[in-house]
Structures are given as C-alpha cells and as structure tokens.
C-alpha cells in the first residue's frame, strides 16, 4: 500500500465534505499481514471462515472493497484524515457482507447487513510505517483488528507501548 495512495485519498477528502453517509471513494484491494500472509474468506449464506494463511503461487488473492468515509469523531489517537477529520473505512469481501467488530467476544466477524451499516462495521484507518495500515474499531477506541493464532481478532493496544506492533499491521495491494 503505497504512500501516494493515502495522499490521493486525502486529496479526495479535501475536495468533498461528506460525513459518514456516502463513501468518499472506494478501493478494491487484497489484504495481507505484515508478514505477507493473506487474509482469505470462505463464505456461504449461513456460515463463514476468515483465514490468515500462506497462499500458493497460482491462488488468486481474495479482495476486499474498502469504502472510505470522513468522520468528525476523534479516536484515541489522531487518524489519517485531514483538517482534524478521521478517515474511516468499511471492509467488504463481497456484496452485502461486511467485516464487523464484536467487542464482547474480541472477534472479527462477517455479517450480512443492509445500509446504513452499524458502527461495528466502521474502522478508523491509520497509516503506519513500512507502507502498512491498521484498523481501529470505531466502537472501541484503542482496539484494533489484528492477527491471533492465524485468525483475525480484536486486539487492545496500549498507546504507551509501540503502536507498530506487527500483529495489527496490514498491507493493502491492488495486485
């Protein structure tokens, strides 16, 4: 996920002042961990699995639709927006399904839902070093999507510690 991508999205935000209702822009990308494992989805009508795994050479990477929104609400740390606005995203692997935070279970789930999406589907986007991003729960500041035991989970991050913790860093790629 190159730095100019964030700059491009920020330019798009500056050009329009939509808050929370419709996405500023949308971007289709594959999602992988800091260690280059792919996030993949196996989804049926009534069940799903989210895997964090090494992919074979011939395996096409799953893509997620990232929809970018502006938010006036500050998170526990300044996010990567402009003029004090937060940049939030929703992540959808296919039509009508979105990743959602389940804060009680500390889990990341896939849910079929209609718009307007619940707050649990929104994540504050943070631009990190090494061309990585992290996703902070809108509903629970300080809690991020992360990798635990080869699955996605919600991970509480202590801001006095290193926010560059590898297990909450993700790469976005159009390839």
């Amino acid at each position: 996920f190159e730095a100019q991508k964030i700059e491009w999205h920020e330019a798009a935000i500056e050009g329009r002042s939509i808050t929370g209702i419709s996405p500023i822009t949308e971007y289709l990308a594959s999602l992988s961990t800091y260690n280059d494992q792919s996030i993949t989805f196996a989804l049926e009508d009534e069940s799903y699995e989210i895997y964090v795994e090494d992919l074979k050479k011939d395996k096409k990477k799953d893509k997620v639709l990232l929809s970018y929104y502006e938010s006036q609400h500050p998170s526990s740390e300044s996010g990567d927006g402009v003029d004090g606005k937060m940049l939030m995203v929703t992540l959808s692997p296919t039509k009508d399904f979105w990743l959602q935070a389940n804060n009680k279970e500390h889990s990341v789930e896939l849910h079929k839902c209609e718009k307007p999406l619940p707050d649990q589907a929104f994540f504050v986007l943070h631009n990190r070093s090494f061309n990585c991003v992290s996703f902070e729960c809108k509903t629970d500041p300080g809690v991020f999507i992360g990798v635990k035991d080869n699955h996605l989970a919600l991970i509480k991050v202590d801001y006095s510690e290193n926010l560059g913790s590898e297990n909450i860093l993700f790469k976005l790629s159009e390839i």
Epitope: F41, A42, E44, D45, K56, D62, K95, F97
Partner: antibody, heavy 126, light 106 residues
Framework: EVQLLESGGGLVQPGGSLRLSCAAS????????MSWVRQAPGKGLEWVSA????????YYADSVKGRFTISRDNSKNTLYLQMNSLRAEDTAVYYC????????WGGGLRYPFGYWGQGTMVTVSS | LPVLTQPPSVSVSPGQKASITCSGE??????AAWYQQKPGQSPILVIY???KRPSGIPERFSGSNSGNTATLTISGTQDMDEADYYC?????????FGGGTKVTVL
C-alpha cells in the same frame, strides 16, 4: 437445504439443439458461480462451462466453445445451458454444480463444486 | 491446460489404507479438490484446497499436494468407500478433472 434440479435432457439428432435448465433452491442463487459438468456413459467427469453470480462473466471448455451458451436468470433462480450443433460426443449426463462458497470481489473461478444436481441425460444420435 | 493422471483402479482390504494419486505438471502450485462418485449417483466433494474436508465427510479422508502429485488417502477404508474418485483443479478459469480412479474394497 441446497437443491439443484436439472431438466431438459432427451434424444436429439446430430446438428440439433437442446436447452438444459437447472432450478436452484435453498441458497442465495445470485451470490454463487455455477457450472455445468458432464459425464459420458462409462467415462469420467468433464467440466463444460461456468458463469459468475451476476451472469456477467462466462467460461467454456474448448470442446464446446462457440456451440454452447451458459446463462442464468437470477430472478427465477435458474441456470441454463443452450446447446447447439450437437455431436455424438456430446452424449452424456449433464450435471449443474454450485461453487462451495460465495463469489468474492476478486471474481474468477477458483472454488470447488460443493453441490451437484442429480443430472439430466442428453443423447445425440440419428 | 494440465493433464491430470490418475491410476484407473486401486484395490484395498477393509480397514487398510488406500492412496489415490493425481499427477500433473506443477500440481503442487494449484489447489486440488477430490470428488467421490458411487454408481448411479452424483459426485460428492470429499476434499478441497488440498487438505480440507467439507462438513459431514469422515476424518478417514485426507489429502496432500506437493511437487507434481496430489494424493487422496482413505485410512481405515470401509465397504461404503467403494466408488470412483476424481481429482480436479482450476487452471486459467478452466476446470480440469483427472480421469478417475475406481476404488475396490476387497
């Protein structure tokens, strides 16, 4: 419960046409890619054609390209295979099959066939 | 397109292990699926993504895939496992099946 029910098979002369249907129920039809797979008497399985959930992308085996057309009507939960210029070697049981998983934004064909119909017999003979 | 080669037949005694191979160029770079088909019936998916079992498939079915060969193993083969077995891969948005292997339980 996922159900796939093929129909439209029968006896047809070489050069003739036939349209197969596959009625689907028990799942969100438009979310899944669907395929046709055939099996000649006493022979193995042969993939024939596939179509994306929206119907926007279609795929064919070389052996049927230009003669067969796959389509779907998501409002009727039905998959079709229009077979033209039929040959004796097209004689087979034709199965419709559903992908194991919902098609993602990445698209393409990559999932196994999770569910199969009972098949419909097509005989091409003079 | 890859040609997937399976042995035409494999014989096994009840309770013993049956191994069915599926050979093709750079097979290990692709994900293999395996289907079971009994006479007069439609195929059933028994293994996907090389090693994974769909719900309802007994644990005695397992798979592996590396190099140029994918393998379906039935450990503790039962009479009910007598059937034809087909491997399958996707290659450039084209489905490819192996020729099939008839497993006979002696």
């Amino acid at each position: 419960e996922v159900q796939l029910l093929e129909s439209g098979g029968g006896l047809v002369q070489p050069g003739g046409s036939l349209r197969l249907s596959c009625a689907a129920s028990g799942f969100t039809f438009s979310s899944y890619a669907m395929s046709w797979v055939r099996q000649a008497p006493g022979k193995g399985l042969e993939w024939v054609s596939a179509i994306s959930g929206s119907g926007g992308s279609t795929y064919y085996a070389d052996s049927v390209k230009g003669r067969f057309t796959i389509s779907r009507d998501n409002s009727k939960n039905t998959l079709y295979l229009q077979m033209n210029s039929l040959r004796a070697e097209d004689t087979a049981v034709y199965y419709c099959a559903r992908d194991l998983w919902i098609q993602l934004w990445g698209g393409g064909l990559r999932y196994p066939f999770g569910y199969w119909g009972q098949g419909t017999m097509v005989t091409v003979s003079s | 397109l890859p040609v997937l080669t399976q042995p035409p037949s494999v014989s096994v005694s009840p309770g013993q292990k049956a191994s069915i191979t599926c050979s093709g160029e750079r097979m290990g770079d692709k994900y293999a699926a395996w289907y079971q088909q009994k006479p007069g019936q439609s195929p059933i998916l028994v293994i996907y993504q090389d090693t994974k079992r769909p719900s309802g498939i007994p644990e005695r079915f397992s798979g592996s895939n590396s190099g140029n060969t994918a393998t379906l193993t039935i450990s503790g083969t039962q009479d009910m496992d007598e059937a034809d077995y087909y491997c399958q891969v996707w290659d450039s948005s084209t489905g490819v099946f192996g020729g099939g292997t008839k497993v006979t339980v002696l």
